[in-house]
Each structure stands twice: as structure tokens, then as C-alpha cells.
């Protein structure tokens, strides 16, 4: 049974040209996190954090994505095209897969950055189904 909950930074905004931290946190489960995938709104992968092997930043984002803090991701040199949904996918054993959603709005104006931290519903599957493409699961 999947008991975990994903907490994310929720809906956040940041200035064009600035940077933002995308954070997810898995709680209420003893499951072992084997890998976290960070994915963009168009289903392109930004980064992988493998528990054993460390980080891999995908080449399309190599100049403006930095790993961390923690299992989070720092997105730099923001453009208006970065506005949209971001997903963290936690692969865990024995629970299976948990997924969190963050919505980032990149602002032209000098509106101050803010973040609303809140709990979102989890989306989970049995571990045996991990062959499925996780990016087929939408909110």
C-alpha cells in the first residue's frame, strides 16, 4: 500500500532572467527512493537524481539547470518559455512511483518572487508497472 505524500513548492513565480528552486519532498513513507526524475511541461526531461549514481542534467538544459539543493533543482536564466508545469517523479521501493506537480510563472515585471507550499494528491502505481512510461500520467 502506498502511504506517502509528495509536498511541493506548488505555484511559484519568478522574474525573467532570474532563477528559481523547484522542490519536492516525499513524506509519510519508509520506502527507499531509488531515483527522482524532473520533467518539464512538454514531457522533456530536465534531470535525473539517481540514489546510487548521482545527478544527470539533460543536455538541452546543461547551461541553466543546476542540481540541488537536495533532490530539488535550480532553474537559472529564466525565459518566458519556462512558464508552465514541472513534475517530480519519485521512483521508490517497494511503494512504486509518486509524482508531484509545480507550476512556474515567469514574470516580465519586477513582481517579487513568492512560493506557496502545499500538499498535492499523490499519483502512485505498483512497482511492477515501472516499465510503463511515467510521462503518460497527467494531472
Amino acid at each position: 500500500m502506498m502511504t506517502g505524500t509528495i509536498e511541493t513548492t506548488g505555484n511559484i513565480s519568478a522574474k525573467k532572467g532570474g532563477s528559481v528552486i523547484l522542490q519536492c519532498h516525499l513524506s509519510s513513507t519508509m520506502a527507499q527512493v531509488t531515483q527522482v526524475n524532473w520533467e518539464q511541461h512538454d514531457h522533456s526531461l530536465l534531470a535525473i537524481r539517481n540514489a546510487e549514481l548521482g545527478w544527470h542534467i539533460y543536455p538541452a538544459f546543461k547551461d541553466r539547470v543546476a542540481p540541488g539543493p537536495g533532490l530539488g533543482l535550480t532553474l537559472q536564466s529564466l525565459t518566458m518559455n519556462d512558464t508552465g508545469e514541472y513534475f517530480c517523479t519519485y521512483h521508490t521501493y517497494p511503494d512504486g512511483t509518486y509524482r508531484g506537480r509545480i507550476f512556474l510563472e515567469v514574470l516580465e515585471s519586477s513582481v517579487a518572487e513568492h512560493s506557496a507550499r502545499f500538499q498535492i494528491p499523490i499519483e502512485g502505481r505498483d512497482y511492477k508497472d515501472d516499465d510503463d512510461k511515467h510521462h503518460h500520467h497527467h494531472h
Epitope: 531515483q35 526524475n37 549514481l53 544527470h56 543536455p59 515501472d130 512510461k133 510521462h135
Partner: antibody, heavy 121, light 106 residues
Framework: EVQLVESGGGLVKPGGSLRLSCAAS????????MSWVRQAPGKGLEWVGR??????????DYAAPVKGRFTISRDDSKNTLYLQMNSLKTEDTAVYCC????????????WGQGTLVTVSS | PYELTQAPSVSVSPGQAASITCSGD??????ACWYQQKPGQSPVLVIY???KRPSGIPERFSGSNSGNTATLTISGTQAMDEADYYC?????????FGGGTKLTVL
């Protein structure tokens, strides 16, 4: 120590099939993205295709010359990578090597010696 | 299909720096890797993710990648560096090798 050992090569007639295997050891195979690369006699390196880890969908990508004829699969429980080659052509003659895609700093292992596939009538 | 172009051959004197280039459309948006292959041997990865060196590869090997060109530089080239060098463009959907450059140490 990271080790990759390919097997299954041999002589096959045009239009025939062959299945290559790659036995991996010394690392957690299930974490790795794995590719097949080939080298025809006296020629350069040519990427054949790859399979991603299951935590990245387990999806496959292929080079245009082999798409629709070759299939890459993996058995993480056996630490083994496979290349099923169908409708073989003479131009598929090459040494076939399995390789670890260089995603991670601590997993950039050596290549195996490869296995020779000869397609000839 | 995506293509990478390498010069067929490069010559260098011992102790000098050798530069081997690889060009491809928007190559800087992908990761460039470099492989060294000596006669009768399997290729060895010498640079990955543009500029990273695997453990065991000497510091004289370095790499860069921007725009349409990736460059492998060998500073203080030694006779043992004579080999074929292949560039590779790597991203999450495809992988392509260049045609290879034969490095001759005069």
C-alpha cells in the same frame, strides 16, 4: 570492476536473424542506459541503438539503418542486454559492442571486446 | 539525419598541443563525447559531457563544446596518444558518431 562481455555473433546468411547478448557485471545494471555500437572492418564507429533504464521508461531509440529490423531489450534480473537482429544485410557485418551511456560521473565503464557478426551468402 | 564532421587526419609533434575538432548543427545543445581507439583495441572514452574526464584518463586530455563545434585538446601530446579519435553527439533521443580523426605523432 565494470565488465561487459558480448556473445552470440557468427556467420549468417542475408535475410537471416541473430541474437546478441551482453553480460554486465561490476555495477547496478538496472540504473544504466545501455547502447549497442558496431564497427565494420576497417571502418569507423556506428551507433546502433540504446535502451534507457526502466526508471526512465525503458524506452528504446535506434539509428535509421537498423530501425524496424533490430530490437534492443534488457533483463535487469539477469544483468543482460540483448540485440535481436532480423532481416540481416551484408552491410550489417561488423563487430558489435555493448556500452554504458555516459550519464553519470561514476559510471563510465570500459567497452567489451565485442562479438563479430558476418552476414554473407 | 544528424551528422558530425571530423577532419580525417591531424599531425602533431611530441610535446605540442593537438586539437581535434568535430562540427555538427547546434552541437553545443548536445553533449559531446570523445573516444580513443588504438589498432586492434576497443575504444576508450576519454571525454564525456563536453569536458569531463573519466577516472584514469590523463589530465592532458580536455574538451569543450559550444555553438556548432566540439574540440578535443591534448596538451603535451605523447607518442602513446597516436590513435583514431571519434567524437560523439549524445542526447536523450539519439546518439551519432563522427567519422573519426587519425592523430599522428610525428
Amino acid at each position: 570492476e565494470v565488465q561487459l562481455v558480448e556473445s552470440g555473433g557468427g556467420l549468417v546468411k542475408p535475410g537471416g536473424s541473430l541474437r546478441l547478448s551482453c553480460a554486465a557485471s561490476g555495477f547496478t545494471f538496472s540504473n544504466a542506459w545501455m547502447s549497442w555500437v558496431r564497427q565494420a572492418p576497417g571502418k569507423g564507429l556506428e551507433w546502433v541503438g540504446r535502451i534507457k533504464s526502466k526508471t526512465n521508461g525503458g524506452t528504446t531509440d535506434y539509428a535509421a539503418p537498423v530501425k524496424g529490423r533490430f530490437t534492443i531489450s534488457r533483463d535487469d534480473s539477469k544483468n543482460t542486454l540483448y540485440l535481436q537482429m532480423n532481416s540481416l544485410k551484408t552491410e550489417d557485418t561488423a563487430v558489435y559492442c555493448c556500452t554504458i551511456d555516459p550519464l553519470y560521473d561514476i559510471l563510465t565503464g570500459p567497452w567489451g571486446q565485442g562479438t563479430l557478426v558476418t552476414v554473407s551468402s | 539525419p544528424y551528422e558530425l564532421t571530423q577532419a580525417p587526419s591531424v599531425s602533431v609533434s611530441p610535446g605540442q598541443a593537438a586539437s581535434i575538432t568535430c562540427s555538427g548543427d547546434k552541437l553545443g545543445d548536445k553533449y559531446a563525447c570523445w573516444y580513443q581507439q588504438k589498432p586492434g583495441q576497443s575504444p576508450v572514452l576519454v571525454i564525456y559531457q563536453d569536458s569531463k574526464r573519466p577516472s584514469g584518463i590523463p589530465e592532458r586530455f580536455s574538451g569543450s563544446n559550444s555553438g556548432n563545434t566540439a574540440t578535443l585538446t591534448i596538451s603535451g601530446t605523447q607518442a602513446m596518444d597516436e590513435a583514431d579519435y571519434y567524437c560523439q553527439a549524445w542526447d536523450s533521443s539519439t546518439v551519432v558518431f563522427g567519422g573519426g580523426t587519425k592523430l599522428t605523432v610525428l
